[in-house]
Amino acid sequence: MKVLQEPTCVSDYMSISTCEWKMNGPTNCSTELRLLYQLVFLLSEAHTCIPENNGGAGCVCHLLMDDVVSADNYTLDLWAGQQLLWKGSFKPSEHVKPRAPGNLTVHTNVSDTLLLTWSNPYPPDNYLYNHLTYAVNIWSENDPADFRIYNVTYLEPSLRIAASTLKSGISYRARVRAWAQCYNTTWSEWSPSTKWHNSYREPFEQH
C-alpha cells in the first residue's frame, strides 16, 4: 500500500481543515488508514482523524482544530496499521479556503432598489471577520447569457443595485462567495442561492 498523491490540506481558518490524498489502488480509507495530526505547541496533544473514501483510491479527512492563529504549524502522519506511509506538515494560515457566507436575502421592498444582504461566516474574534471581501453572482433563470458578477470590496456584507439594471418581470437568482486578500486565500464555496421575481416601475418616457 502506497500513497500516490500526497495529502494536501486547506483550512477554514476557524476549526476545520480538510486533507485529501490518493492511494495507489482501491482503498477502504476508514478501515485501513489513520491520519494523526498535532499542533506544534507546548500544550497540544495528538489527534486521530478517520478518513472517508473520496472516489476509489481517494481519501479525505476533516481535521478538528483549535482556533487558528497565523503561526500555527501541524505535523501530519499517515498510517496504515503499524506502517508509516507519509509524514508531512501543514500551516493552516498558508492554505486558507474561507467558509461560505450564509443567510443570503434579497430585499425588494426598497423603492426601485435591490438590497442583498448576507452573513459573515466568522465570529467577530476571528481574524478573517474583518478581512473578507465578496463576489455576488446574479443570473436569470430564463436567459443563461444574463449572468453577472458584482465585486464587493468593502467590509459590509451587503450590495445595493438598481432594480432597473436587471430585466423586469422575470426571476433571478443570486449567490455569494468570499475571500481574504490578507492570506491570499482561495474563494469560498458559493452560498446557497436565493430566488426573487424582479419587477419595477418603468419610468415614463418623455417625448
Epitope: 476549526s15 507546548l42 500544550l43
Partner: antibody
Framework: EVQLVESGGGLVQPGGSLRLSCAAS????????MFWVRQAPGKGLEWVSG???????SYADSVKGRFTISRDNAKNSLYLQMNSLRAEDTAVYYC?????????WGQGTLVTVSS | EIVLTQSPGTLSLSPGERATLSCRAS???????LAWYQQKPGQAPRLLIF???SRAPGIPDRFSGSGSGTDFTLTISRLEPEDFAVYYC??????????FGQGTKVEIK
C-alpha cells in the same frame, strides 16, 4: 465581544489555599488555550500556567507542585487552585486567552498572602 | 530558559516624538513567537504586536514592530498622550514556555 472575568482573589495566610475562577464569553472557549499570568505590586508580568484544549498543562517553575490549572468547557470556565501560598505569590492574577501570545486579558483579581 | 532584556528601563519623551523600545533575547527567538504589550496603570495589558511585526486588531498604525533573532524593536512613530504607559515584550518557546521582559516605561518629559 470577548470577555474574561476573574474572581476568587482575597487575603490568605501563608501556607493557605485559594481557588481563582475565570468566566469566559464571546468566543469558543473549548477551542482555545487559556492561561494565568500574574503581576506582583509594582513589578512586571510573569506567566504562571497554561492549559491546552485537550487538557495538557504547563507551569512556571515558581509554582510547580503548588498550583493546579483546570478548565470546564461546559461552563466556559478556567480555574487556578493555589496551595501552600507564599508571600511572594502576592499579585494581581490575570486570566488570558492565547497561544504563543495572549490576545485577550481579564481585568485581574488581587491575591494577597500575608499573616 | 530564554531571558528577555528590555531597554531603556524608562524613556522620557514629549508627545509627537518618536519612541524606540528595544527587546533583546538571550537566545534566538522565532519571529512568529515574539509579541509586544502595552499596560496602563490599573489596567490589564493589551496586545499590540504579534509575530514580531503584525499589529493586533484595532491597534493604530503608529505602532510598529521589527527585528529578528535576538534583537527586536517596538517603534511608536509619533507619541500620542494615551501612549504613555509601560511596554512589555514576550516570547514563547516550545520547551520553556512563555517569558516576559521586565518592561519599559514611556513617560512624559
Amino acid at each position: 465581544e470577548v470577555q474574561l472575568v476573574e474572581s476568587g482573589g482575597g487575603l490568605v495566610q501563608p501556607g493557605g489555599s485559594l481557588r481563582l475562577s475565570c468566566a469566559a464569553s464571546g468566543f469558543t472557549f473549548s477551542r482555545n488555550a487559556m492561561f494565568w499570568v500574574r503581576q506582583a505590586p509594582g513589578k512586571g508580568l510573569e506567566w504562571v500556567s497554561g492549559i491546552g484544549t485537550g487538557g495538557a498543562t504547563s507551569y512556571a517553575d515558581s509554582v510547580k507542585g503548588r498550583f493546579t490549572i483546570s478548565r470546564d468547557n461546559a461552563k466556559n470556565s478556567l480555574y487556578l487552585q493555589m496551595n501552600s501560598l507564599r508571600a511572594e505569590d502576592t499579585a494581581v492574577y490575570y486570566c488570558a486567552r492565547g497561544r504563543y501570545y495572549f490576545d485577550y486579558w481579564g481585568q485581574g483579581t488581587l491575591v494577597t498572602v500575608s499573616s | 530558559e530564554i531571558v528577555l532584556t528590555q531597554s531603556p528601563g524608562t524613556l522620557s519623551l514629549s508627545p509627537g516624538e518618536r519612541a524606540t523600545l528595544s527587546c533583546r533575547a538571550s537566545q534566538s527567538v522565532s519571529n512568529s513567537y515574539l509579541a509586544w504589550y502595552q499596560q496602563k496603570p490599573g489596567q490589564a495589558p493589551r496586545l499590540l504586536i504579534f509575530g514580531a511585526s503584525s499589529r493586533a486588531p484595532g491597534i493604530p498604525d503608529r505602532f510598529s514592530g521589527s527585528g529578528s533573532g535576538t534583537d527586536f524593536t517596538l517603534t511608536i512613530s509619533r507619541l500620542e498622550p494615551e501612549d504613555f504607559a509601560v511596554y512589555y515584550c514576550q516570547q514563547y518557546d516550545h520547551s520553556a514556555g512563555w517569558t516576559f521582559g521586565q518592561g519599559t516605561k514611556v513617560e512624559i518629559k
